[in-house]
């Protein structure tokens, strides 16, 4: 059997760090057997069998010129094996962030915080966090850990399905390369990372006979499974063409009548969604839809209470009528109140999405 431990990575390749001493191991001999070392294609002896280093070649302070293929020979001139040296760096803690577009699934993405230059893989798992009271020690419910299944197409993403909205989870993303492993832990709760997809199917139509009105309607994003306790609320913005500022209203339901449109001008309209109890954040804006108020015969405009803030159709209220939410109000986040780095010696930048 070979005296050389096989690091994770392609066979026949051994690894080291630039600027560090590197040991290469002759794979086809017995441990301790004296061998001669050559660079592939070069006749010059690098290290002879009398070096006292047995089956190993030592390169002091390796640099990029040392990368390449090496050949080791036994005392009788037989080939002991060929070894390719690749230099790079041990893993650093990856940068990890998690997102949720609905209330029962979330995904986490990662990227290296430093480029190692070596073959790299990521191990992803998660666990439900539980703080046990002394009297509940006898029965610890199943909290994992479980694997976080990675996207099959090699994207740096894994998805947790069937998460509990009120639970907190710990994600473990470990970067592994032939020189070691480094782990990033991240605690996530659906209620804090929830960001719905934008509403879909936005339509803007004129209201015949009302030159200052536009009727906008939209649907829930397809990714959001509607349930009485997990509804969305919406925010609608509109502006006339060439007008820089948006007007904002919060409609009730899935449609809104704008009552202060500028007659004769096309208007851009967009909508955003958020959990109706303010978990997480607002979605991105939907693609803009355009509409121009009617120029038909004028109806008497009835002054409405909203004073240009948009008027909801009665049908919407009926349509959205549902039982009172059986969901507790959101807990304040118990997180640090400042930005000092505590239990880690390594500092990493986090990209906010």
């Amino acid at each position: 059997s070979s005296p050389c431990p096989q690091a994770w990575g392609p066979p026949g390749v051994q690894y080291g760090q630039p600027g560090r001493s590197v040991k290469l191991c002759c794979p086809g001999v017995t441990a301790g057997d004296p061998v001669s070392w050559f660079r592939d294609g070069e006749p010059k002896l690098l290290q002879g069998p009398d070096s006292g280093l047995g089956h190993e070649l030592v390169l002091a302070q390796a640099d990029s010129t040392d990368e390449g293929t090496y050949i080791c020979q036994t005392l009788d001139g037989a080939l002991g094996g060929t070894v390719t040296l690749q230099l790079g760096y041990p893993p650093a803690r990856p940068v990890v962030s998690c997102q949720a577009a609905d209330y029962e699934n979330f995904s986490c993405t990662w990227s290296p915080s430093q480029i190692s230059g070596l073959p790299t893989r990521y191990l992803t798992s998660y666990r439900k966090k539980t703080v046990l009271g002394a009297d509940s020690q006898r029965r610890s419910p199943s909290t994992g850990p479980w694997p976080c299944p990675q996207d099959p197409l090699g994207a740096a993403r894994c998805v947790v399905h069937g998460a509990e909205f009120w639970s907190q989870y710990r994600i473990n993303v470990t970067e592994v390369n032939p020189l070691g492993a480094s782990t990033r832990l991240l605690d996530v709760s659906l209620q804090s990372i929830l960001r719905p997809d934008p509403p879909q199917g936005l339509r803007v139509e004129s209201v015949p006979g009302y030159p200052r009105r536009l009727h906008a309607s939209w649907t829930y994003p397809a990714s959001w499974r509607r349930q009485p306790h997990f509804l969305l609320k919406f925010r609608l913005q509109y502006r006339p063409a060439q007008h820089p500022a948006w007007s904002t209203v919060e409609p009730i339901g899935l449609e809104e009548v704008i009552t202060d449109a500028v007659a004769g001008l096309p208007h851009a309209v967009r909508v955003s969604a958020r959990d109706f109890l303010d978990a997480g954040t607002w979605s991105a804006w939907s693609p803009e839809a355009w509409g121009t108020p009617s120029t038909g015969p004028l109806q008497d405009e009835i002054p409405d209470w909203s004073q240009g803030h948009g008027q909801q159709l009665e049908a919407v209220v009926a349509q959205e009528d549902s039982p009172a939410p059986a969901r507790p109000s959101l807990q304040p986040d118990p997180r640090p109140l400042d930005h000092r780095d505590p239990l880690e010696q390594h500092h990493h930048h986090h990209h906010h999405h």
Epitope: G133, S140, P334, H349
Partner: antibody, heavy 126, light 112 residues
Framework: EVQLLESGGGLVQPGGSLRLSCAAS????????MGWVRQAPGKGLEWVSY????????GYADSVKGRFTISRDNSKNTLYLQMHSLRAEDTAVYYC???????????????????WGQGTMVTVSS | QSALTQPPSASGSPGQSVAISCTGT?????????VSWYQQHPGKAPKLLIY???KRPSGVPDRFSGSKAGNTASLTVSGLQAEDEADYYC???????????FGTGTKVTVLG
């Protein structure tokens, strides 16, 4: 059953060394932050040391820094406290404890010890 | 790493409420929402009562509640019972040396 069991305590002379062990069972040890807390006879609790799930980061109280080393072997589900240059004031019951911790995108924080061992007595005396 | 300051003792009759304060600095109690409270009976290991200022672990009665204002955290035990007679300690993330810090401890006596 979720359990922590300390061992290794005993009588040692000033300047001597001792190694405490804490065997964990009933939970996935490698995912948890762990710590040591001590209590001198008739006194209050004193936070001693703390270690990351992977063992990569540690923390110590000023009173033991440079003399005590915390470590863990996740393959054996065991936490250790190596104590050197022991003093009379190190005499105490030493508890091993588990912490969920809290990990943000950049940092992890000590949170609360939810599971405790029964303690092991260390006596430093000549 | 100075210990957090607690009153040495507190007392109340059965059914009454007792509040224990825990004063630190902006580097510990005031700077982080990682304040926890423990109960310890003589000769026993401590038991977690409250974590992250206000949260109760499973199995801890709702007679125990926590709060915080500025650099001072508080534990309130309402509806005192005989078995609540014990030592109580607060703890906080310490903000330095990857460290935590405990309070000086409060002995609660249930009168009568």
């Amino acid at each position: 059953e979720v359990q922590l069991l300390e061992s290794g305590g005993g009588l040692v002379q000033p300047g001597g060394s001792l190694r405490l062990s804490c065997a964990a069972s009933g939970f996935t040890f490698s995912w948890y932050f762990m710590g040591w807390v001590r209590q001198a006879p008739g006194k209050g609790l004193e936070w001693v040391s703390y270690i990351y799930p992977s063992g990569g980061s540690t923390g110590y109280a000023d009173s033991v820094k440079g003399r005590f080393t915390i470590s863990r072997d996740n393959s054996k589900n065991t936490l250790y406290l190596q104590m050197h240059s022991l003093r009379a004031e190190d005499t105490a019951v030493y508890y091993c404890a588990r912490d969920e911790g809290y990990c943000s995108s950049t940092s992890c924080y000590f949170d609360a010890f939810d599971i405790w061992g029964q303690g092991t007595m260390v006596t430093v005396s000549s | 790493q100075s210990a957090l300051t607690q009153p040495p003792s507190a007392s109340g009759s059965p059914g009454q409420s007792v509040a224990i304060s825990c004063t630190g600095t902006s580097s510990d109690v005031g700077g982080y929402n990682f304040v926890s409270w423990y109960q310890q009976h003589p000769g026993k290991a401590p038991k977690l009562l409250i974590y992250e200022v206000t949260k109760r672990p499973s199995g801890v009665p709702d007679r125990f509640s926590g709060s915080k204002a500025g650099n001072t955290a508080s534990l309130t035990v309402s509806g005192l019972q005989a078995e609540d007679e014990a030592d109580y300690y607060c703890s906080s993330y310490g903000g330095s040396n990857n460290a935590g810090v405990f309070g000086t401890g409060t002995k609660v006596t249930v009168l009568g």
